[in-house]
């Protein structure tokens, strides 16, 4: 059997000492004679010890004994004991009591023989058994003074050999995870929850994680059981990015030919119906009105121009009603209305002129007279020696109710090559040149254009009292939207409850599925923030699509191009949502087209403005944007630019 070097040395040393034992005893007798009974010199002491180390150790101490107890001749017993103990360096014992097995006296020295687990010259140093091969322990080795023991990590127990460890199966205890799923792991276990939930060790249950506290969303975050959704400021032109957390700009995906003509004047800019141009003509010389211009529109009704004095004096208004020219005139307080000529709201350019002759007014379309009206008086009215005429374009300088026959003054039309009173007009041209909002789209088609920066709203009623039902009110919302979108996100149609600041109903384009967190181009039908139905749509193909929505008591359908959408709610949820909608419809609601007012982004799945062409039919009635309670001035009510032709 092989022993470690240290143990071998300790084992050999005592044997070596025993060989000298006879000499030690002889030396003790010799010391008695020479130095205890007699007084000895250093040389005599050297003869006793026969070596210098022990002599050098002994002699100074021998002299100390003499100083302390007197010379040998005084026969003081203390002296004899003092001298006899000097050669034994184990008295008093210099070795550590705890760690020493025995002390051996050496020549002027001593040797401490250590117990197992101890080391050092005095056997006072603990030997760290764990420093070599972890003391033979599989996991944890604990060093102790003079000893060591093995232990295991949490979740393991020590085997009977005192060295190896085995895993404890905590899941064997059914209470380990409470409501959560338990999974045993080497030395441990894990309580598992579904995604979006986290284990609560105190409650021993799965609790919803509020991801919103982790700042995952760039803008607005809404937590939900096991999940969360991010929302972006749609009204600010933002939508969710691919990662469903950050926001990005809503960019046009279909290029529309929105180029404008600097030599054109757009008449539909002022939704208020106020004129787009006001001109004051003043002459010393009596003058007659001559106005000529090229005109283009799809709008059936609106005011082209007004010429004359104040509302109670003499004036004419050239307007459009049912697509034909109408002339309203008031001369010295007497009003008349005349309508004649072809339908001119076909969207093509034509030349229109108004000429005041000596006793009549002549209206021409493409140089052909369509109206000739006898008048008694002049449009230029004398005042303080000067003749005055006010001319306004695209509106009248007073309220439309003060016309001979009320008309909706708003006219989505375009003028070019205008000539007022045979004079060149630099003022309007200069103004139009620097103001793009006063210019028309170079090319237009039928429809209404929503530029992605505003909405229109109406005050419509969705409750009805059928004759066969007596007084019981029922409700219905049926929307048909013909759309040619330019961007993939935006509100097509919505209802807003101003009192509650809620969005009872919305139909919108969206480019992701919020619950599946999946990017996909969809039309969403929602009541408040809950999607009732979704339907895929090829939104960026530049084609016209028909979105049909029908909601009534007990049913809600969404169709895109004749294909029915997928329901997102259970039958019970649908009934609950429709009840919410009906409650809203019993209170005042506003009907929005192309966007929403400033509502929280969480009010509806989409809050962004729609960009593209759209015509809306609500409950089988075509919505005319000129009839809206409000329309953003950049929305063109009766014209839409075409899709830009693809580059060759």
């Amino acid at each position: 059997a092989l022993l470690p070097a240290r143990e071998a040395t300790q084992f050999l040393r005592p044997r070596q000492r025993r060989a000298f034992q006879v000499f030690e005893e002889a030396k003790q007798g010799h010391l008695e004679r020479e130095c205890v009974e007699e007084l000895c010199s250093r040389e005599e002491a050297r003869e006793v010890f026969e070596n210098d180390p022990e002599t050098d150790y002994f002699y100074p101490r021998y002299l100390d004994c003499i100083n302390k107890y007197g010379s040998p001749y005084t026969k003081n017993s203390g002296f004899a004991t003092c001298v006899q103990n000097l050669p034994d360096q184990c008295t008093p014992n210099p070795c550590d009591r705890k760690g020493t097995q025995a002390c051996q006296d050496l020549m002027g020295n001593f040797f401490c023989l250590c117990k197992a687990g101890w080391g050092g010259r005095l056997c006072d140093k603990d030997v760290n058994e764990c420093s070599q091969e972890n003391g033979g322990c599989l996991q944890i080795c604990h060093n102790k003074p003079g000893s060591f023991h093995c232990s295991c990590h949490s979740g393991f127990e020590l085997s009977s050999d005192g060295r190896t460890c085995q895993d404890i199966d905590e899941c064997a205890d059914s209470e380990a995870c409470g409501e959560a799923r338990c999974k045993n792991l080497p030395g441990s276990y894990s309580c598992l929850c579904d995604e979006g939930f986290a284990y609560s060790s105190q409650e021993k249950a799965c609790r919803d994680v509020d991801e919103c506290l982790q700042g995952r969303c760039e803008q607005v975050c809404v937590n939900s059981p096991g999940s969360y959704t991010c929302h972006c400021d749609g009204r600010g032109g933002l939508k969710l990015s691919q990662d469903m957390d950050t926001c990005e700009d809503i960019l046009p995906c279909v290029p529309f030919s929105v180029a404008k003509s600097v030599k054109s004047l757009y008449l539909g800019r002022m939704f208020s119906g106020t004129p787009v141009i006001r001109l004051r003509f003043k002459r010393l010389q009596p003058t007659r009105l001559v106005a000529e211009f090229d005109f283009r529109t799809f709008d059936p009704e609106g005011i082209l121009l007004f010429a004359g004095g104040h509302q109670d004096s003499t004036w004419i208004v050239l307007a459009l009603r049912a697509g034909r020219l109408e002339l309203q005139l008031r001369y010295n307080g007497v009003g008349r209305v005349t309508s004649s000529g072809p339908v001119i709201n076909h969207g093509m350019w034509q030349t229109i002129s108004v000429e005041e002759l000596a006793r009549n007014l002549v209206i021409k379309v493409n140089r052909d007279a369509v109206m000739k009206i006898a008048v008694a008086g002049d449009l230029f009215q004398p005042e303080r020696g000067l003749y005055h005429l006010n001319l306004t374009v695209g509106g009248i300088p007073f309220h439309e109710k003060d016309l001979v026959q009320p008309i909706n003054p708003r006219l989505d039309g375009c003028m070019r090559s205008w000539n007022w009173l045979n004079g060149e007009d630099t003022t309007i041209q200069e103004t139009v040149k620097v103001n793009t909002r006063m210019q028309c789209f170079s090319v237009t088609e039928r429809g209404s254009f929503y530029p992605g920066s505003g909405f229109a709203f109406y005050s419509l009623d969705y409750m009805r009292t059928p004759l066969d039902v007596g007084t019981e009110s029922t409700w219905e919302v049926e929307v048909v939207a013909h759309i040619r979108p330019a961007a993939d996100t935006g509100v097509l149609f919505a209802l807003w409850a101003p009192d509650l600041r809620a969005v009872p109903l919305s139909v919108a384009l969206v480019d992701y599925h919020s619950t599946k967190k999946l990017k996909k181009q969809l039309v969403v039908l929602a009541v408040e923030h809950t999607a009732l139905a979704l339907m895929e749509i090829k939104v960026c193909d530049g084609q016209e699509h028909v979105v049909t929505v029908s909601l009534r008591d007990g049913e809600a359908t969404l169709e895109v191009d004749g294909t029915r959408g997928q329901s997102e709610v259970s039958a019970a949820q649908l009934q609950e949502r429709l009840a919410v909608l009906e409650r809203h419809l019993r209170s005042p609601v506003l009907t929005f087209a192309g966007g929403l007012p400033d509502v929280p982004v969480t009010s509806a799945p989409v809050t962004a403005f729609y960009r593209g062409c759209m015509t809306l039919e609500v409950n089988r009635r075509l919505l005319d944007l000129d009839e809206a309670a409000y329309k953003h001035s950049d929305i063109t009510a009766h014209s839409c630019p075409p899709v830009e032709p693809a580059a060759a």
Epitope: F281, R283, L284, P286, L386, L421, N422
Partner: antibody, heavy 116, light 107 residues
């Protein structure tokens, strides 16, 4: 473009007569009346009156009634200012200006100097 | 006859300074006031017409305000090229009347 071109400067003796012309181009002459404005050296502007280019009827301000006459040659699209019995105080630059209730288009001016 | 009183008769400013000229009328003329600039040897140039309307091509440093009988013409950040005589003209009633003029010089 619209232009009003006046005749050149004249040096006259007191008691003489002068006739200044103002030729219009770039617009229908009869659609706008023609005004005349006087500016004495180092002094301000004074409206003298106007002439109806349709009827030829002149209108003078009080100060310029009597020795002053506005006339037309419609075929030549020209207006005239004649000053009879010139006086030293008639020394001035005379401008024609198209009637628009105010004056946008002006002739370059004709300096008449009356000196013995 | 509506008389027009223009002030000051002359003023001297450094370039970049603001100029204010005032015209007061003897009768209420609504906003039928016009403002002209005349440089030596040239006819007057219409800067602002009735209704405080800046004429096409006239720099935006020129502006006017007023209604009734009190009217103000302003040049913001005067330039050396603005040295000229300035006149107001009322076109509310016949006879048309000019202000006496303001001579603008540079310091």
């Amino acid at each position: 473009q619209i232009q009003l071109v006046q005749s050149g400067p004249e040096l006259k003796k007191p008691g003489e007569t002068v006739k200044i012309s103002c030729r219009a181009s770039g617009y229908t002459f009869t659609n706008y009346g023609m005004n005349w404005v006087k500016q004495a050296p180092g002094k301000g502007l004074k409206w003298m009156g106007w002439i109806n280019t349709n009827t030829g009827e002149p209108t003078y301000t009080e100060e310029f009634k009597g020795r002053f006459a506005f006339s037309l040659e419609t075929s030549a699209t020209t207006a005239y200012l004649q000053i009879n019995d010139l006086k030293n105080e008639d020394t001035a630059t005379y401008f024609c200006a198209r009637d628009e209730g105010w004056f946008v288009y002006w002739g370059q001016g004709t300096l008449i100097t009356v000196s013995a | 006859e509506t008389t027009v009183t223009q002030s000051p008769a002359s003023l001297s400013v450094a370039t970049g300074e603001k100029v204010t000229i005032r015209c007061i009328t003897s009768t209420d003329i609504d906003d039928d006031m016009n403002w002209y600039q005349q440089k030596p040897g040239e006819p007057p140039k219409l800067l602002i017409s009735e209704g405080n309307t800046l004429r096409p091509g006239v720099p935006s440093r020129f502006s006017s305000s007023g209604y009734g009988t009190d009217f103000v013409f302003t040049i913001e950040n005067t330039l050396s090229e603005d040295v000229a005589d300035y006149y107001c003209l009322q076109t509310d009633s016949v006879p048309l009347t000019f202000g006496a003029g303001t001579k603008l010089e540079l310091k």
